[in-house]
Amino acid sequence: GLECDGKVNICCKKQFFVSFKDIGWNDWIIAPSGYHANYCEGECPSHIAGTSGSSLSFHSTVINHYRMRGHSPFANLKSCCVPTKLRPMSMLYYDDGQNIIKKDIQNMIVEECGCS
Amino acid sequence: GLECDGKVNICCKKQFFVSFKDIGWNDWIIAPSGYHANYCEGECPSHIAGTSGSSLSFHSTVINHYRMRGHSPFANLKSCCVPTKLRPMSMLYYDDGQNIIKKDIQNMIVEECGCS
């Protein structure tokens, strides 16, 4: 997956730091106070859909074969720049019952982006 | 994740059968001859982004909190209807060296869709 460098507008991973205070979650998330969540941004022209080598690649490559052949409804189905590899992170937080929990929360950090 | 029923245009899973002959892969995939790959389709209005209970939920909920607060660049970042749960499938195929391989291929079947 590409890292965004400002030079291309193709689907890439953009660095982004989330502050839990900014979104009002600091009253239930004890630690950390924030983290590098990152996000995905950019164009997904038809020739790169399903070519990210991502977890979606088999499925999206299959769909893209239909799309490229103008098969309805895939011809109009827009390929999207989305997280294709996410990583967990450990958090200390109050759960629904106000008990303190330390847990690895899945899919918190975007590691790679690709075209769906 | 919703199943598409023709009544709603909200992000949902659409049934779709892939024929390997249709996409010209029948010369290297021995079995099966095709499979129910399914795909994701539909709108992702802001109020359902990150509320799917999907594998993307923590990250997309975080981003949605910024989006709803009009935080640049998320205000313009479109939430996308994408696979959030994929399932493997066993395949019999010829590898690059024309050896016959039987393998579980990851992420072949879309089980659930959600808004990124």
Partner: antibody
Framework: QVQLVESGGGVVQPGRSLRLSCAAS????????MHWVRQAPGKGLEWVAV????????YHADSVKGRFTISRDNSKNTLYLQVNSLRAEDTAVYYC?????????????????WGQGTTVTVSS | DIQMTQSPSSLSASVGDRVTITCRAS??????LGWYQQKPGKAPKRLIY???SLQSGVPSRFSGSGSGTEFTLTISSLQPEDFTTYYC?????????FGQGTKVEIK
């Protein structure tokens, strides 16, 4: 500490309207889903409505749909329930309740903090 | 809509008794269920969340179990302050729905 204080209840004639308010303090109001739950005299609890943390999504119980409207003003940390076309069966204590607008592993957060309630009496 | 059928509607017991209250959901709700205690003239207070987890600050004599459609609240040894009304709530899908309530009375 976390506090929810309801107001706006009273005695009202059938067919009339009221606006219930709930003032929130001690937490980041704009990050929580908010609900109204009511309880008729001597009866059980009935869920009435919910509004998402950002006001983008609302659900109402069938019994109040079209007559009651939930809303919020995050800048004032206040939740509202506009109650129109009141009926005798709407007589109840109305509670304002908080829930975290988040889910994880298909667990959806429930009702955790309740106000003390405001009483609405519909009588001619 | 999901119906929550709570039973019994009332029960008589003595201090020290073990009591069980049941809630049955008309369709599967995973573990999206809470148990609430309500004393006369007061707001409800949650005892159990996620079907089986004890709310912080609640005595350990209260416990919950179940998943899917069948749920129970158990009070292992009734104390004088436990003689009041209990409700279950499903928060799996809207509209959220409460059970009819169980009044625990002194025998």
């Amino acid at each position: 500490q976390v506090q929810l204080v309801e107001s706006g209840g009273g005695v009202v004639q059938p067919g009339r309207s009221l606006r219930l308010s709930c003032a929130a303090s001690g937490f980041t109001f704009s990050s929580y889903g908010m609900h109204w739950v009511r309880q008729a005299p001597g009866k059980g609890l009935e869920w009435v409505a919910v509004i998402w943390y950002d006001g983008s999504n609302k659900y109402h119980a069938d019994s109040v749909k079209g007559r009651f409207t939930i809303s919020r003003d995050n800048s004032k940390n206040t939740l509202y329930l506009q109650v129109n076309s009141l009926r005798a069966e709407d007589t109840a204590v109305y509670y304002c309740v908080r829930s975290r607008n988040w889910n994880y592993d298909n667990y959806y957060y429930g009702l955790d903090v309740w106000g003390q309630g405001t009483t609405v009496t519909v009588s001619s | 809509d999901i119906q929550m059928t709570q039973s019994p509607s009332s029960l008589s017991a003595s201090v020290g008794d073990r009591v069980t209250i049941t809630c049955r959901a008309s369709q599967g709700i995973r573990n999206n269920l809470g148990w609430y205690q309500q004393k006369p003239g007061k707001a409800p207070k949650r005892l159990i969340y996620a079907a089986s987890s004890l709310q912080s600050g609640v005595p350990s004599r209260f416990s919950g179990s179940g998943s899917g459609t069948e749920f129970t609240l158990t009070i292992s040894s009734l104390q004088p302050e436990d003689f009041t009304t209990y409700y279950c709530l499903q928060h799996n899908s809207y509209p959220w729905t409460f059970g009819q309530g169980t009044k625990v009375e002194i025998k």
